[in-house]
Interface confidence: low
């Protein structure tokens, strides 16, 4: 049996938005899912398709889209079908219409004292609240003989007057949007009486010192009158104008001169006209200084020979807009061709090495000119000068590889040494000419180097090997003092190396052979048993032919190693009592004893009156407190080698003796009693 | 973290004026109506004004005339301009955003901020 | 002016109850289903319940449920929680033409029997 998993349900949607039927079937066999709309197949489109076996509405269409949607499985095999639950959009939706005249019938009938009807002409779902307008002023309910609802479509002026004439409008909102009207109604209802615009003043705008005209007439029978005010409601007229419009002119036509307008005359100026009867009107018309900003600065360009390149200009801020221009070379740039102004744009096509130089953006407009140069280079692909010839460098003295390129704008040069990138630090240093210095030429610097020298219309590179030549040193160099214990086999390394693998001798300092069994196997001298005599002075020569040779002195001494004929032992002592560390060593040279406590070394010179360390090497502590208490460390050494040995103390509190312990009780520790 | 925070409430003297700030952070506010709302010590809830998002504002009766909102879609803030407050008008004072574009129902409410008008 | 009428003002319940609070409009709602119910506690901002008359907001128990369309509406806690002891508000949308886009009732406290 076919079964719906989910089952299209009925929602709210939105004109244009996106919405998604849900459809899932679960069958024994392949089924294939369609839908329906009133029992009609829906066939996909770009805006309503299937998507699995939901159905999709990229942008739901409140026409398209009303009614019944079914989704229905079927198997084909064996003819079994299934329909899922009717589902519908409750679709909300806001359109645009016009003011219309629902009464009466046509313009021609209206006359003063005539009931008006104008019919908003907007809908949607849910039902829109309107809002009336006349002359872009909101109408609400209560006001001169006007009835409006701001839900209602209808607005009735009853009974209509000359007051009531102007341009209607209309604007309705609901959940769903804001629309207005698409086309206005001009309710003209003529009273002679009343003042008629026949010339409206125009906003200006003026430079500096220059003169501003503002018109206005009206015309009423009888003549109505006419009034300029300033921005405070200061009444202008040829016999009392305000201190700041002193250079101001009414004409007999109502028409109002500014003279030499300075900043402080900006603003708003009202042109009043006032019938015998009706209301006043008012026009209003703005007096604007014209001013221009400075213009931001240019960064540098640099574009490539063959490619299309725009710079755009900026215009700055000004009033009226700045008319935006560019020049090159004094000339002004042509709207077509090769390189153009489009807009505010420099255009520049299959640029050409030519093309290099200063463009120049102007602005301009009543307040002045502005102007901006940028500068445009065009690059063009590096050539060589010198490129890096393979070279041999020695061994720690600095090392040059050379690449000198040319090209515009001064390519950049990088290096890299077995195609790694060489970054510059202590060793490493790229000149501004593109040369390499190595500060100190290392074997291993033998090796690869290429250099590519770039700039934006391309790129350049080569490629040299660097020999080392090494020099002749030991490796590593013999420590020069050295220490062998008596009567036990020794040996003493020694190797070099040069351009040439050297050969390596030792010899005694003084000239004399080495014994017979003290024998020099390639570099290495063997001593087979050490005795009293080993010790002394030794060279080590190593030499070859191109680089001659070179010698190394060690001062070999015969020790008898350290050894502790004494070891500090495990030490518990009672606070406030002396304690005792002993330590004492034996070799040849003589060892020195130092102890180290609590991980510092004591210092005898700075010990203080508790602690002493004696001749033979005990270390003692008076009066011994609980933060004594730690891991003491004797160390033996010599100029041959150190030796160490530990031991920790502790320090307790003396025991409060009991009644029934005897003067003569054992503690129950070991410990140092004094 | 979706939220709306109010601000500019204090003690006023009455005559006096105060302008209420609702920042919204985490929403862009100017896709929502805006709704003030008040509630005075121990009332209900009282509807003060409602802003919409095409820069229509409708208020109260009791609001109309004293009272003004208006937006700053720049600062994502709607601010509550008061005049000539009383007593009465002592409240807690809360932004609101709406519930969707298809409806003025609130869905998020500020913490509120608190205006005392007294001498 | 429009007034959205609540009752019962103060209600008392236990634990389990079922309780049922009422909203009426003095004139139809915008879209018939524009009604909200909020909970709100003592010093708190209120929160959200139910929209549209009968959609529950998220994160809300499946306990609160409501239903009405028009005028009249209702808000029902199938079986009270201690977490539900509060005031209890609705919401409705107007046309904004006689000044009023929205009302509040006045309230329904909800206290502990």
């Known amino acids: 049996a076919i079964v719906f998993i989910k089952q299209p349900s009925s929602q709210d949607a939105l004109q244009g938005r996106r919405a998604l039927l849900r459809c899932e079937v679960e069958a024994p066999g392949p089924v294939h899912v369609y839908w329906l709309l009133d029992g009609a197949p829906v066939q996909d489109t770009e805006r309503r398709f299937a998507q699995g076996s939901s159905l999709s509405f990229a942008a739901v269409d409140r026409l398209q889209d009303s009614g019944t949607f079914q989704c229905v499985a079927r198997d084909d095999v064996t003819g079994e079908e299934a329909r899922s639950a009717n589902a519908s959009f409750n679709i909300k939706w806001i359109e645009a219409g016009p003011v219309v005249l629902k009464h009466p019938a046509s313009e021609a009938e209206i006359q003063p004292q005539t009931q008006v009807t104008l019919r908003c002409h907007i809908d949607g779902h849910p039902r829109p609240t309107y809002q009336w307008f006349r002359d872009g002023t909101p109408l609400s309910d209560g006001q001169s003989n006007h009835t409006v609802s701001s839900k209602e479509r209808n607005l009735t002026l009853r009974p209509a007057g000359p007051e009531h004439s102007g341009l209607y409008s209309c604007c309705a909102h609901s959940a769903f949007g804001q629309a207005c009207s698409s086309q206005n109604f001009t309710l003209s209802i003529a009273d002679e009486s009343f003042a008629r615009v026949v010339l409206a003043p125009q906003d200006v705008v003026v430079a500096r010192y220059e003169e501003a005209m503002f018109h206005c007439q009206f015309s009423a029978q009888p003549p109505p009158s006419l009034q300029w005010l300033f921005e405070d409601e200061t009444p202008i007229t040829n016999r009392s104008r305000p201190p700041h419009l002193r250079r101001a002119t009414v004409f007999a036509n109502g028409s109002l001169l500014l003279t030499q307008v300075r900043p402080r005359n900006a603003g708003i100026y009202r042109c009043i006209g006032q019938g015998q009867r009706g209301p006043p009107i008012i026009l209003e018309a703005t007096l604007h200084l014209a001013e221009i900003e400075d213009m931001p600065l240019f960064e540098p360009r640099v574009f490539t020979a063959g490619s299309e390149e725009r710079v755009t200009c900026l215009p700055p801020k000004g009033l009226p807009e700045p008319s935006v221009w560019w020049e090159h070379a004094g000339v002004r740039l042509p709207t077509h061709g090769r390189v153009y102004q489009k807009g505010h744009e420099l255009v520049l096509a299959n640029i050409a090495e030519s093309d290099a130089g200063v463009y120049t953006c102007h602005a301009a407009n009543l307040a002045g000119q502005r102007r901006q140069d940028v500068n445009i280079t065009v690059a063009t692909v590096p050539s060589w000068l010198k490129k890096p010839q393979d070279s041999q460098l020695e061994e720690g003295k600095p090392g040059y590889l050379d690449c000198l390129t040319q090209a515009t704008p001064k390519p950049t040069v990088v290096w890299y040494r077995n195609q790694m990138l060489i970054s510059e630090d202590s060793r490493f240093e790229v000149f501004k000419n593109g040369t390499l210095r190595i500060n100190s030429v290392e074997v291993y610097d033998g090796t690869w180097y290429r250099c590519m020298s770039s700039t934006p219309a391309g790129s350049i590179e080569a490629q040299a090997r660097v020999q080392v030549l090494e020099k002749l040193k030991f490796t590593p160099p013999p420590q020069p003092q050295q220490c062998m214990e008596f009567d036990k086999e020794a040996t003493v390394p020694c190797s070099a190396t040069g351009r040439e693998k050297p050969t390596i001798k030792w010899e005694r300092a003084d000239g004399s052979s080495l014994p017979e069994w003290v024998t020099d196997n390639a570099g290495t001298l063997h001593f087979a048993r050490v005795t009293r005599d080993d010790a002394g002075n030794y060279t080590c020569i190593a030499s070859n032919g191109p680089q001659g040779q070179i010698r190394a002195h060690v001062q070999l001494t015969v020790a008898v190693f350290i050894t502790f004929k004494v070891e500090p032992e495990r030490t518990t002592v009672y606070q406030g009592h002396t304690a005792l560390l002993q330590c004492e060593a034996q070799g040849d040279p003589k060892p020195l004893i130092q102890w180290k406590g609590k991980d510092r070394i004591l210092d005898p010179t700075k010990l203080g009156p508790r602690m002493h360390i004696f001749q033979n090497g005990s270390l003692v502590i008076h009066d011994v407190a609980p933060e004594d208490s730690g891991r003491y460390t004797c160390i033996a050494g010599n100029s041959c080698n150190i030796k160490h040995t530990e031991a920790p103390l502790y320090v307790v509190d003396k025991p409060v003796p009991e009644e029934s312990e005897g003067p003569g009780s054992p503690p129950p520790y070991k410990m140092i009693q004094t | 973290e979706v939220q709306l925070v109010e601000s500019g409430g204090g003690l006023v003297q009455p005559g006096g004026s105060l302008r209420l700030s609702c920042t919204a952070s985490g929403i862009d506010l100017s896709n929502y109506a805006v709704i003030w709302v008040r509630q005075a010590p121990g009332k209900g809830l009282e509807w003060v004004g409602i802003?919409?998002?095409?820069?229509?504002?409708y208020y109260a009766n009791w609001a109309k005339g004293r009272f003004t909102i208006s937006r700053d879609t720049s600062k994502n803030t709607v601010y509550l301009q008061m005049n000539s407050l009383r007593a009465e008008d002592t409240a807690v004072y809360f932004c609101?955003?709406?519930?969707?574009?298809?409806?003025?129902?609130?869905?998020?409410w500020g913490q509120g901020t608190l205006v005392t008008v007294s001498s | 002016e429009i007034v959205m009428t609540q009752s019962p003002s103060t209600l008392s319940a236990s634990v389990g109850d079922r309780v049922i609070i009422t909203c009426q409009a003095s004139q139809s709602l915008y879209n018939n289903k524009d009604l909200a119910w909020y909970q709100q506690k003592p010093g708190k901002a209120p929160k959200l319940l139910i929209y549209e008359a009968s959609k529950l907001a998220s994160g809300v128990p499946s306990r609160f449920s409501g239903s009405g369309s028009g005028a009249e509406f209702t808000l029902t806690i199938s079986s009270l929680q201690p977490d539900d002891f509060a005031t209890y508000y609705c919401?409705?949308?107007?046309?904004?033409?006689?000044?009023?886009?929205?009302?509040f009732g006045q309230g329904t406290k909800l206290t502990v029997l």
């Open positions: 919401l409705g949308e107007f046309s904004c033409g006689s000044g009023d886009c929205l009302a």
């Open positions: 609101a955003r709406s519930f969707s574009d298809i409806s003025d129902l609130i869905k998020l």
């Open positions: 802003h919409y998002t095409y820069d229509t504002t």
